[in-house]
Interface confidence: low
């Protein structure tokens, strides 16, 4: 509930004699601050007694009467000092000065806090002409006051190049506290103090803080404005606010939410966005962050295959872009993938997990132990080998491919040939005599065409030669093949 | 059900000490800042003190009237509220009751749950 | 001290009247005002607190206003169990202090 202070008036005359003017108010400002203690503003209205001379500037006009009487000295006369009232009501205040009518032209304007008012809207000036001097009356009204019209008031008028210079008239513009800092909502760690900062001004002064948490009262003596909120430490989200007092009553602040930074919500939505023979592109969905930023993120794989010893691969990533591409993976293999995320609190727990397959590839290593040798009988020349290791293969093998390259005296031949899976060995027709022959085998599968094995050279004689030994791939540390005639 | 059960009332002569207790159950007696409110007879109730949450150490706060003189405690385990008096006064005579600050209530505090009370009375 | 100011002290009115009961505190105390009824020989029973707001139980006969320093309880269509001592207690800061009582009689 917004407490209204009471309002009263006091109003009196502002001119005396035959002026007219007096201090209005659309309701009448502040005069007086009811309260206990005893507690009155500083400055109240303080009207003048007439003829008392003007403190302020004044100017001595140097023009003398038919009857050579000095006239007395120019001044604006004294008016209300300090008028209080509340935000929203209007106020009228008055300037008045007696000018002899020698003067002519005479123009009053109005300055607040040291800047011309330049076509104040409720300024107005009324003249009221006598034998011997005019009286001047300039009025201010504001119809509706805010805080921004708070300041010191002043009329000045020119006068033989001499500047008059009324007594300020200082309007304070009182309401409910006006927040000049809130509390910021934060996340926090659990059980770890922190800080809030609530800072409210008047007028009227002072203000009074009090926190309030969950819509309970949390300090039990009102603060003095600013204050600081030290909150030892939370164990679950809480909101904060302050309130402000004064006189005039009281303004709430906005609510905030003082969050509890926690373990994120593990990832979801994992999918697998492209896939080859040795690696998997995932992509997933963060889940709730805890209130604390992400840090990286790890993404967990393992072999689906029930024969496998269970074992887990590891790989860990930035939080951003929600993409990994995991590589060094199997071909043709089953793969149960999940993902985690960590924040400052810790780890998030392992998204659902999905289950991903690498594609067919192209086998990852030759044909072992390659051998070759001369059958002159039926003038072919013999191939055998192992196939490579089943894991190696990379898929299912479709047959193999064997490179033989003939040379002579100036001749190269390269022929390939397809054979099928079964079985390891080929027999090819000699193309030349008395030449080299270099064979190459490397396995296929659908995936593509394996690496070529070493190549296993034997030399084909002219035709009359007995006797023929087998050339084969050398044992591993042999740098080149050794050919045995 | 909420309930605060005094007990310890009686009479003991000007200068003596006397201890109160109160009982409390049906509610989590760590989480509420508890108070002892006193009435002497025929007249109007009066604030004596009250003891913190334990979130807020369980320190206390008195009144000018009874500060230096009494002392509020707790056994949290016991959930027992204490109130020790000492150098008791003839104007300390009159009916005692501890009460509950709401729930999460952290201000100068209305007091929601009240006990059935017990006399002391101070005489030579 | 903020000083609580019941009145008046006491007061006598029959079933099915409307009686009301001011307190007024010695300086600002917003809306920090709790009312308390009070049976003979029985401890106190919270009614308002927040100075409008009923407490749990409580009949929607009895109602609470006012703020600053000036407030009220207003009980509508008095019954027989109504009849105690009211106490009001502001909560502004501490020490929290209780007005002096009104003493509720069947006339």
């Known amino acids: 509930a917004i407490t209204e202070a009471r309002e009263e008036a006091k109003p009196y005359p502002l001119f005396p004699g035959p002026f007219p003017g007096s201090l209005q108010t659309d309701h009448t400002p502040l005069l007086s601050l009811p309260h206990a203690s005893g507690y009155q503003p500083a400055l109240m209205f303080s009207p003048t007694q007439p003829g008392r001379p003007h403190t302020g500037n004044v100017a001595i006009p140097q023009v003398t009467s038919v009857e050579s009487k000095p006239l007395p000295p120019l001044a604006f006369k004294h008016t209300v000092g300090h008028i209080i009232l509340s935000e929203h009501k209007g106020v009228k205040f008055n300037c008045s000065i007696s000018v002899p009518n020698i003067y002519q032209d005479t123009t009053i304007s109005w300055w607040k806090d040291g800047k011309e008012l330049l076509g104040a809207h409720h300024a107005i000036t009324q003249f009221y002409p006598d034998d011997e001097v005019t009286a001047i009356i300039a009025s201010f009204s504001i119809t509706s006051v805010q805080r921004s019209d708070n300041g010191s008031y002043i009329c000045k008028m020119k006068i033989n190049n001499e500047e008059i210079v009324s007594d300020p008239i200082y309007i304070e513009v009182q309401g409910l506290p006006h927040f000049t800092k809130q509390p910021e909502s934060m996340n926090v760690t659990r059980n770890t103090a922190f800080n809030l900062t609530c800072q409210a001004v008047g007028p009227p002064e002072p203000v009074n803080i009090f926190w309030v948490q969950n819509s309970s009262r949390v300090n039990e003596q009102p603060e003095k404005s600013p204050s600081v909120l030290t909150v030892p430490g939370l164990t679950e989200m809480a909101v904060f606010s302050c309130e402000a007092h004064n006189d005039k009553g009281l303004t709430v602040s906005k609510g905030v939410q003082i969050n509890i930074k926690a373990i994120p919500s593990p990832p979801t939505e994992v999918s697998i966005r492209n896939s080859t023979a040795h690696s998997i592109l995932i992509s997933w969905v963060p889940g709730f962050d805890g209130y604390s930023p992400f840090r990286n993120c790890s993404i967990q794989v393992k072999e689906a295959d029930p024969l496998s010893n269970g074992s887990v691969m590891i790989f860990n990533t930035s939080a951003l872009p929600h993409l990994y591409q995991i590589k060094q993976l199997q071909a043709l293999a089953n793969y149960s993938i999940g993902v985690s995320c960590m924040n400052e609190i810790g780890w998030s727990a392992v998204s659902p997990w999905i289950l991903a397959s690498t594609t067919e590839g192209a086998p990852s290593v030759a044909p072992l132990n390659v051998t070759v040798f001369l059958n002159e009988s039926s003038d072919n020349v013999d191939i055998r080998w192992m196939k490579p290791p089943t894991k190696q293969q990379d898929g299912e093998l479709v047959g193999y491919r064997i490179s033989h390259v003939w040379q002579s005296a100036g001749i190269s031949k390269e022929l390939l040939e397809e054979v099928g899976q079964n079985g390891s060995r080929a027999r090819i027709s000699v193309q030349v005599h008395n030449a080299t022959c270099t064979v190459r085998i490397a396995a296929v599968t659908r995936g593509g065409v394996g690496p070529f094995s070493d190549p296993v050279k034997i030399f084909i004689p002219a035709h009359g030669w007995v006797d023929y030994a087998p050339s084969s791939t050398p044992a591993p540390g042999n740098a080149d093949p050794v050919l045995i005639i | 059900e909420v309930k605060l059960v005094e007990s310890g009332g009686g009479l003991v002569q000007p200068g003596g000490s006397l201890s109160l207790s109160c009982a409390a159950s049906?509610?989590?007696?760590?989480?509420?800042?508890m108070t002892w409110v006193r009435q002497p007879p025929g007249k109007a109730l009066e604030w004596l003190g009250f003891s913190r949450n334990k979130a807020n150490g369980y320190t206390t706060e008195y009144s000018a009237s009874v500060k230096g003189r009494f002392t509020i405690s707790r056994d949290s385990s016991q959930s027992i509220l204490y109130l020790q008096m000492n150098a008791l006064r003839a104007e300390d005579s009159g009916t005692y009751y501890c009460?509950?600050?709401?729930?999460?209530?952290?201000?100068?505090?209305?007091?929601?749950?009240w006990g059935t009370g017990t006399t002391v009375t101070v005489s030579s | 001290d903020i000083q609580m100011t019941q009145s008046p002290a006491s007061l006598s009115a029959s079933v099915g009247e409307t009686v009301t009961i001011t307190c007024r505190a010695s300086e600002n105390i917003y809306s920090y005002l709790a009312w308390y009824q009070q049976k003979q020989g029985k401890s106190p029973q919270l009614l308002v607190y927040n100075a409008k707001t009923l407490a749990e139980g409580v009949p929607s006969r009895f109602s609470g206003s006012g703020s600053g320093t000036q407030f009220s309880l207003k009980i509508n269509s008095l019954q027989p169990a109504d009849f105690g001592s009211y106490y009001c207690?502001?909560?502004?800061?501490?020490?929290?202090?209780f007005g002096g009582g009104t003493k509720l009689e069947i006339k």
């Open positions: 207690q502001h909560y502004y800061r501490t020490p929290p202090t």
């Open positions: 009460a509950r600050f709401p729930p999460h209530y952290y201000a100068g505090g209305y007091f929601d749950v």
């Open positions: 049906g509610f989590t007696f760590t989480d509420n800042y």
